[in-house]
């Protein structure tokens, strides 16, 4: 059910904030914001507004009891999630009450305000407002006058407006930041017998940029090893600034010195430090000491304080480069070599070179990382870096060999570098072509001469530059008096053709055809493959009907007179 009493409202409210009327409240409200309160009726949404979460009703305008003494409104409480009303819509009344015994009340118990430091006298700080609910037509009971009880000589208040202003020149935040001012509001025009109320105004001087950054020392010295990569922080410098916030923000820059191109300075936004970093690769052997002039400046400067001097400071930074024993450096990032697959053992493929970049120019020895050449196919001359074979190669087994060569300083074996070597094995014609598959075909007893009974395909493991070119022929021992011919199609295929009209499977059930396949590369490679041809009974469409199974089961004793 709804929980409220009749609402009364003091007329003639003059405050800057809305005037609190009362609270609509349902006993279904768990206080968790799950309900939404809705107001309708006289002046709803205009004269009277409701906080939809709390049910607090406020009057937005000055109300006049003589003009309208009663407002009739309706209230709803709705579940925010479902839209379901938790109470029936209900009517309530707001009565405008006219009383004459109210003291001025400030809209806030405590005000907080800010004003920039170093402000001119008379600068606006904040306006405090007190209201008196009495009838303003009744004497001066609603006439309020403001005065300052605490806070002089720093601040003053305008008696009629409640406007607080600065009253002292050059108030410096760096000396004092917080002020507590007590303001009194008195009705009856401030005369004796008037009622009064007070409020506290906590005033904070906000910072302006009236202090420059300053380095605590004129010279800084840092050391860094020559191996420091670009971006490496070398050291931090920090200028201090008595201001705060963006007025204390510092930007660091290198303005001069022979290290201008070699180093950078980055501003750390969190700590306001300048971080000196390496910009380019250093070389102890070339230059051992750099001097920089670093400047700290405020990015945001207020022109009216420029008379105090420049808002920047500079310091000298001396950077000492420390020597580092560096590993050898190869002449290339990677080496690509090639060698024929028929190369003899100890054939030289190429060479690598590496040098110690240090001033000492320590001698270097070379070795193969055996993890990358487990089969020890390659070796290296430890003195001159020549790469040579230590085993025979086969391109058909492995086309590329990827190995790693190590260069090590002889005087300091801890200093070593590695480089990848990519060795390509070049093709040599060392494989004969052979049938792409095992061929077993059949011929019909009633076959006509020159009838194609099988197409042959070949493969070759080699990879000649101009592509494969195979030729096919009957083996010499089978060429004369053969019952079949080989027709080379000149496209790396060949056909087996019948050579006579009709075959008798009772006379000869199976023929074995030896076929020679040759490639066209140097040196020429060839192989002989055998094609089995079975004689079968066929229907008039040429579909096989039966063959002698013995041809498959007992191949011994078969004629090779193909």
């Amino acid at each position: 059910s709804w929980m409220w009493n009749q609402f009364f409202l003091l007329e003639e409210y003059t405050g800057s904030d809305y005037q609190y009327v009362g609270k609509l409240h349902s006993d279904q409200d768990r206080g968790d914001g799950s309900l939404k309160y809705i107001l309708s009726g006289d002046g709803a949404g205009d004269l009277f507004i409701i906080n939809e979460n709390t049910g607090d009703i406020q009057a937005t305008k000055r109300l006049d009891r003589e003009e309208k003494p009663v407002y009739i409104l309706r209230a709803q409480a709705i579940n925010r999630r479902t839209g379901r009303p938790v109470e029936p819509e209900s009517e309530f009344i707001i009565k405008i009450h006219d009383i004459n015994d109210n003291e001025p009340i400030f809209t806030k118990e405590v005000y907080t305000a800010t004003v920039p430091e170093m402000s001119d006298v008379g600068t606006f700080v904040v306006q405090v407002t007190a209201t008196d609910a009495d009838d303003p037509t009744y004497g001066n009971s609603a006439k309020v006058v403001y005065s300052i009880l605490q806070g002089q000589p720093y601040f003053s208040v305008e008696s009629e407006t409640g406007i607080i202003k600065t009253a002292l020149l050059n108030m410096d935040r760096e000396n004092r930041e917080q002020y507590q001012v007590v303001i009194q509001a008195k009705d009856m025009g401030g005369q004796m017998g008037g009622l009064s109320g007070t409020t506290t105004v906590n005033i904070t001087l906000t910072d302006v940029n009236d202090n420059p950054p300053r380095f605590p020392q004129s010279t800084y010295q840092f050391k860094t090893p020559e191996s420091s990569p670009p971006g490496t922080p070398i050291g931090r410098i920090k200028a201090s600034d008595a201001d705060v916030g963006e007025n204390a923000e510092i930007e660091y820059s290198i303005t001069d010195g022979e290290g201008l191109d070699m180093f950078d300075v980055i501003t750390d936004q969190e700590t306001q430090e300048g971080i000196i970093t390496v910009k380019k690769l250093l070389d102890f052997e070339k230059k051992k000491v750099y001097t920089l002039k670093v400047e700290a400046s405020n990015p945001y400067v207020e022109p009216r304080f420029l008379y105090l001097g420049p808002f920047k400071d500079s310091a000298t930074v001396r950077i000492v480069v420390e020597d580092v024993d560096e590993p050898p450096v190869f002449s290339k990032l990677a080496y690509i070599l090639q060698i024929r697959e028929d190369a003899q053992i100890n054939t030289t493929i190429g060479s690598v070179t590496a040098q110690d970049p240090d001033a000492a120019r320590n001698p270097v020895k070379y070795s193969v990382d055996r993890h990358t050449d487990m089969d020890r196919i390659f070796n290296i001359d430890s003195g001159n870096g020549s790469i040579f074979t230590s085993k025979l190669l086969d391109r058909e087994t492995l086309l590329w060999h990827n190995i790693t060569v190590i260069a090590t300083e002889i005087n300091n074996p801890k200093q070593s570098s590695r480089v990848p070597l990519y060795i390509k094995v070049l093709d040599v014609n060392d494989n004969a072509p052979e049938f792409a598959e095992f061929y077993e075909t059949f011929v019909c007893e009633k076959a006509k001469a020159d009838q194609l009974i099988q197409t042959l395909h070949a493969v070759d493991k080699d990879d000649p530059y101009s592509g494969h070119q195979f030729s096919f022929s009957l083996a010499p021992e089978a060429a004369s008096g053969s019952n079949f011919t080989i027709q080379d199609n000149k496209d790396n295929t060949a056909g087996i053709l019948t050579r006579k009209n009709g075959y008798n499977r009772h006379e000869m059930s199976t023929y074995l055809l030896p076929v020679v396949i040759s490639d066209n590369d140097y040196p020429v490679q060839s192989s002989t493959g055998t094609v089995t041809v079975r004689v079968c009974a066929c229907d008039h469409h040429g579909n096989m009907q039966s063959c002698h199974a013995e041809a498959l089961i007992h191949p011994t004793g078969l004629s090779t007179g193909a």
Epitope: I78, T82, G83, P85, P88, E89
Partner: antibody, heavy 117, light 111 residues
Framework: EVQLVQSGAEVKKPGSSVKVSCKAS????????MHWVRQAPGQGLEWMGD????????HYTQKFKDRVTITVDKSTSTAYMELSSLRSEDTAVYYC??????????WGQGTTVTVSS | DIQMTQSPSSLSASVGDRVTITCRAS??????????MHWYQQKPGKPPKLLIY???NLESGVPSRFSGSGSETDFTFTISSLQPEDIATYYC?????????FGGGTKVEIK
Amino acid sequence: EVQLVQSGAEVKKPGSSVKVSCKASGYTFTNYWMHWVRQAPGQGLEWMGDIDPSHSETHYTQKFKDRVTITVDKSTSTAYMELSSLRSEDTAVYYCARGDLGRFDYWGQGTTVTVSS
Amino acid sequence: DIQMTQSPSSLSASVGDRVTITCRASESVSIHGTHLMHWYQQKPGKPPKLLIYAASNLESGVPSRFSGSGSETDFTFTISSLQPEDIATYYCQQSFEDPWTFGGGTKVEIK
């Protein structure tokens, strides 16, 4: 401008889980309930559950109670819906929608979840 | 659970026609004069869009040819003059009681 932006499409195996996100902007995240509604291919709309971002109070439909978990991250104004023990019939477009007084006044663009072995 | 029966499941009408869709709840979805029934439009490949809330209130930005009425268990959604851009599926939804449920949808096509 109120916007609800959902995470991208997901392909999941049966038995696994999926977690769909919904990033809200253009309004005070904690002032409105966030709901999840799904729509199987060629089918109608099916309400799964909702959450009050300010208190993380949740409501789930009985059908999904043991498999669905709705959460929020107030710091990023993001709502999440995790559905576990997925089966092929969970293949659907999953929508987040802002709730206001029982109605869904703003919807996400939808996230397609495909459950397939 | 409150069952929402929407009819017809599909309809075909001409441009300019008056189109009416009904939605029946298995129990009352009204309380204290508030009817917790809402209507949505969904076009293919898009999320639904709120048209009518609390049975008869037009959502901001929605054309006035759309309207809704009804109370308790019987509700009606009307398009006073069908336009080509109204081709879509329309759904009713109740928020009276958990779980919130939708009607099966009505597919509206142009003849």
